[in-house]
């Protein structure tokens, strides 16, 4: 538990950048959580710097992270999941910069997974669909997901729709006919906890049925 | 205002239990840790444990491990600590603290109930 | 686990004098609180993270330190300043120490 590192110390260690970002996943592992920080500068020397998270944790003072080549990790059922943690980089007792974090308010949730379209040709419309492991936890429960679709050949041209459920219709009409379309998906915490986005589901693609000119409407693949 | 006020004085016999309960008003129940701090007579203070009011995570003063039971009830915001095998040098004031999660002091107390453990 | 060593453990000062209280620990802390005592009442948070002034906290009362050592100095003693004084570490296990009765000479 040393403070900051004292004027005069580490000299060369103190001209490097060592700021840091982190995110939590809850019930990651069961009734794990984990912690993963990183640097943000890449070119930092990580050869022999250390994390270590005190405060805010279950009949331990401290935890140190173990090192996953340029990330930093923990998995452990010791988070509190109240209040502000201090989490320090530290070479050997000393510590070269701190942040206090509410390991709350830096959750990332997993990816949602099982993205599918399915045409409903009666309807005239896509319903999607996916799932989200976060339906079983305890804590993380309640998610906005932004769900993003574009034609295959608009390389930057998506399309959002936010939703809390994981379920979502596209009508037929507001898609190009016979067209290729990419759709994928991602995660925020939206209830309690805050944070970041997840990583992107992969991706799914389908094609919109040709238009059936007798009637205007698109034909089913 | 913020305010906790504890249950009233107690006495036991030896291997009895005790329940102390903590009433919560003036701010959000689920959002502070709730901490339970004891105090001999004419002694210092002694931190027993502390509980997460929003999903019930504890953490316990080795100490008191095995003995000492803490819970909540978020819909009256009340926190309990119930301590068993009393013996007499259990004989003490016991207080409520309400913990401040950005910098970890009790910022908030309750007035302290007496336990009082005598055969 | 960490002790914390209160000096003196009874300061006896006349109104309008300085006070310095110790808190020594046995290993570094990187945070300290203290807290404010009177008889048949519970403790008051009086300076937190070393040197924070908790609400109401007079300012001729000041809080410094690192590493093991930590002090608590009020500048000029007034009549109500005459109490217990704790200090306390911010992490688990919440140690605090033995306390300083700060006494009327």
């Known amino acids: 538990e040393s403070g900051y590192a004292q004027n005069g110390d580490l000299e060369d260690a103190e001209l490097d950048d060592y700021s840091f970002s982190c995110y939590s996943q809850l019930e990651v592992n069961g009734s794990q959580h984990s912690l993963t920080c990183a640097f943000e500068d890449p070119d930092v020397n990580i050869t022999n710097l250390e994390f270590e998270i005190c405060g805010a944790l279950v009949e331990v003072k401290c935890l140190n992270f173990r090192k996953l080549q340029e990330i930093y990790f923990i998995e452990t059922k010791k988070f509190l999941l109240i209040g502000k943690s201090n989490i320090c980089v530290k070479v050997g007792e000393k510590s070269l910069t701190c942040k206090k974090i509410d390991l709350t308010t830096i959750v990332k949730p997993e990816a949602p997974f099982d993205l599918s379209v399915v045409y409903r040709e009666g309807a005239n419309d896509f319903v999607v669909t996916f799932n989200t492991s976060h339906l079983q936890k305890k804590y993380v429960k309640v998610l906005m997901h932004d769900v993003a679709y574009r034609q295959e050949k608009d390389e930057n041209k998506w399309t959002h729709v936010n939703l809390s459920s994981t379920k979502l219709t596209l009508l037929q009409r507001k898609l190009q006919p016979a067209a290729m379309y990419e759709i994928k998906v991602r995660s925020i915490p939206d209830h309690y906890f805050k944070g970041f986005w997840s990583e992107w589901s992969p991706s799914y693609y389908f094609r919109t049925p040709e238009i059936n000119n007798s009637s205007g409407e698109m034909d089913p693949i | 205002q913020v305010q906790l006020v504890q249950s009233g004085a107690e006495v036991k016999k030896p291997g009895a239990s005790v329940k102390v309960s903590c009433k919560a008003s003036g701010y959000t129940f689920t959002g502070y840790t709730m901490n339970w701090v004891r105090q001999a007579p004419g002694q210092g203070l002694e931190w027993m444990g502390l509980?997460?009011?929003?999903?019930?995570?504890?953490s316990y003063n080795q100490k008191f491990k095995g003995r000492v039971t803490l819970t909540r009830d978020t819909s009256i915001s009340t926190a309990y600590m119930e301590l068993s095998r009393l013996r007499s040098d259990d004989t003490a004031v016991y207080y409520c603290a309400r913990g401040d999660g950005n910098y970890w002091y009790f910022d908030v107390w309750g007035q302290g109930t007496t336990v009082t453990v005598s055969s | 686990e960490i002790v914390l060593t209160q000096s003196p453990a009874t300061l006896s000062l006349s109104p309008g004098e300085r006070a310095t209280l110790s808190c020594s620990a046995s290993s570094s802390v990187t945070y300290m609180h203290w807290y404010q005592q009177k008889p048949g009442q519970a403790p008051k948070p009086w300076i937190y993270?070393?040197?924070k002034l908790a609400s109401g906290v007079p300012v001729r009362f000041s809080g410094s330190g690192s590493g093991t050592s930590y002090t608590l100095t009020i500048s000029s003693l007034e009549p109500e300043d005459f109490a217990v004084y704790y200090c306390?570490?911010?992490?688990?296990?919440?140690?605090f120490g033995g306390g300083t009765k700060v006494e009327i000479k």
């Open positions: 993270e070393i040197s």
């Open positions: 509980i997460n009011p929003y999903n019930g995570v504890t």
């Open positions: 306390q570490e911010w992490n688990y296990p919440y140690t």
